[in-house]
Amino acid sequence: AITEAREEAKPYPLFPGPLPGSLQTDHTSLLSLPHTSGYQPALMFSPTQPGRPYTGNVAIPRVTSAGSKLLPPLAFKHTVGHIILSEHKDVKFNCSISVPNIYQDTTISWWKDGKELLGAHHAITQFYPDDEVTAIIASFSITSVQRSDNGSYICKMKINNEEIVSDPIYIEVQGLPHFTKQPESMNVTRNTAFNLTCQAVGPPEPVNIFWVQNSSRVNEQPEKSPSVLTVPGLTEMAVFSCEAHNDKGLTVSKGVQINIKAIPSPPTEVSIHNSTAHSILISWVPGFDGYSPFRNCSVQVKEVDPLSNGSVMIFNTSASPHMYQIKQLQALANYSIGVSCMNEIGWSAVSPWILASTTEGAPSVAPLNVTVFLNESRDNVDIRWMKPLTKRQAGELVGYRISHVWQSAGISKELLEEVGQNNSRAQISVQVHNATCTVRIAAVTKGGVGPFSDPVKIFIPAHGWVDHAPSSTPAPGNADPVLII
């Protein structure tokens, strides 16, 4: 059952003097009626209590058909004006009105703060008919009130397109202070001032604030809500909270951690994803950011071959993604790689260094002294060359690639041959007579194909010619040789 939950009731002031006869009678007789719900309506006036009708919004009935007697204006009877109660208590309040029986289809609706209360609200309307009038009691109950139930409640009744409105009933739900703004976790610079804000509301007001740092009160005297705490600076992490006090008791905010920004921890797990002759793709796992977002990272690359200079290359990159392709590296070299990242405070230490190697590169020079001549049988072209002076970074020579292009009137075709690294000569079959054969040779390592030599051209005559003089790589700056045989 809903119990009476009135901690304090304040009726609106009532004017002395009797009510107009019929309403006064109705009022008196109403109290003696049984209540179908079984509950005594909250704060009903006793028969001896003086009262007045609400005159702000009344329905004036017309002359009745039975005679010329005017009916009194209709108005809701006065009830309690202000109910104060604690959170989670139950409350019931009502409106009552006596309506002459000449009116049909009267309905009462409840409104809160100007909005009609529809749906699943505990509103009950009871009708008590008599000879001339019907007493109507509209009850509204709230179980376990919350702050959101605070507000001004009124009843409305529509009769003959007229609207009758009751006096408002103010519901004030009081409880422990309720935070509307709590301090927020922050990351702050060491020894730099910052502010924390705390705001709490009642009712009841006032609400007073105490600040707590690491379980100790900061202010001796409370501050009225809202309160801003200026912390002059911290050297180490601290936890702050605020206490909000009112007459109902105390509420403590969440504790918030104030972190001191620091340089980041070094990245970890630097990994090699891919190596080529001149680049290495790495990734890393960022360290702890020191309570300040990463700004960028630095990839440090150090030559570590025993005979290397030890040159250090530093590549700056964005903090995300945690990957970087290191370029401009030497082929077939060993490197030590570390990563460091920075935030607004500074650079982290370098990650643990990892060793990485580049692969063999392609040769950077072409074979030397390429010569081409037609052999005695005239069925083959002999090609000779000298091994190039490849740099060690190119790795081991695995062979040579020979390109020979055959051109005659309307025909041009390129063929490629591969020969082993121990060769310094090759024979190719004549593809077309009365044509020019252009030969180029490139050295090949595991790292790839090097540059081709300058082209050497030889003319392959029609059958019956005799000359076998060779063509050879030109001296630098000369035009491509063409030997007509």
Partner: antibody
């Protein structure tokens, strides 16, 4: 131009320690490995170890571990080699060298004598 | 450790001679080999790196060759100032090791 300056000589007593310095100039100190090499009178060359001033990374010849300790002072662009528990066997010229042995100091003659 | 063996221990030459100094590694070191010249009372001087790469400022009469474990330093036409001790050095793996040296002297 690149210069590696070493004191000409150090005279120390047996059992004592000595810290040989090598002051670098004419290049970025933190860019190259610094090697240390020992040469006993009339003998060949022995590699002691190397240190990288960028991060104090070191590699030692196992033979000299416990005998030599390599350090750097970036603020003065100086590399140091400390030799401990000295005996007559440690009497030698000690060279510092950088850039894949392209540049050498003049050497410091350490004489261990009572 | 890799042992570097140099031969001959001493080489007597006449100015203008072409000479070859040999260096053999106890294991394959690819071309990770340096050659140094050390004159009396001086610091060593790098002549050739990575077996055959010339060094800026070194006279062109000095050249290096070889790969794997056998290496040669050649002096095309010996000059009197070339007198000194020549060392080869393993640069393949730690510890870095030097040969005992070849002493070049004038006849």
């Amino acid at each position: 131009q690149v210069q590696l300056q070493q004191p000409g000589a150090e005279l120390v007593k047996p059992g004592a320690s000595v810290k040989v310095s090598c002051k670098a100039s004419g290049y970025t100190f933190t860019s190259y490995w610094m090697h240390w090499v020992k040469q006993r009178p009339g003998q060949g060359l022995e590699w002691i170890g190397r240190i990288h001033p960028f991060d104090s990374d070191t590699n030692y010849n196992q033979k000299f571990k416990g005998k030599a300790t390599l350090t750097v002072d970036k603020s003065s662009s100086t590399a140091y080699m400390q030799l401990s528990s000295l005996t007559s066997e440690d009497s030698a010229v000690y060279y510092c060298s950088i850039a894949g042995f392209a540049y050498w100091g003049q050497g410091t003659l350490v004489t261990v004598s009572a | 450790d890799i042992v570097m063996t140099q031969s001959p221990a001493t080489l007597s030459v006449t100015p203008g001679d072409r000479v070859s100094l040999s260096c053999r590694a106890s294991q394959i070191i690819s071309d990770y080999l340096n050659w140094y010249q050390q004159k009396s009372h001086e610091s060593p001087r790098l002549l050739i790196k990575y077996a055959s790469q010339s060094i800026s400022g070194i006279p062109s009469r000095f050249s290096g060759s070889g790969s794997g474990s056998d290496f040669t330093l050649s002096i095309n036409s010996v000059e009197p100032e070339d007198v000194g001790v020549y060392y080869c050095q393993n640069g393949h793996s730690f510890p870095l090791t030097f040969g005992a040296g070849t002493k070049l002297e004038l006849k």
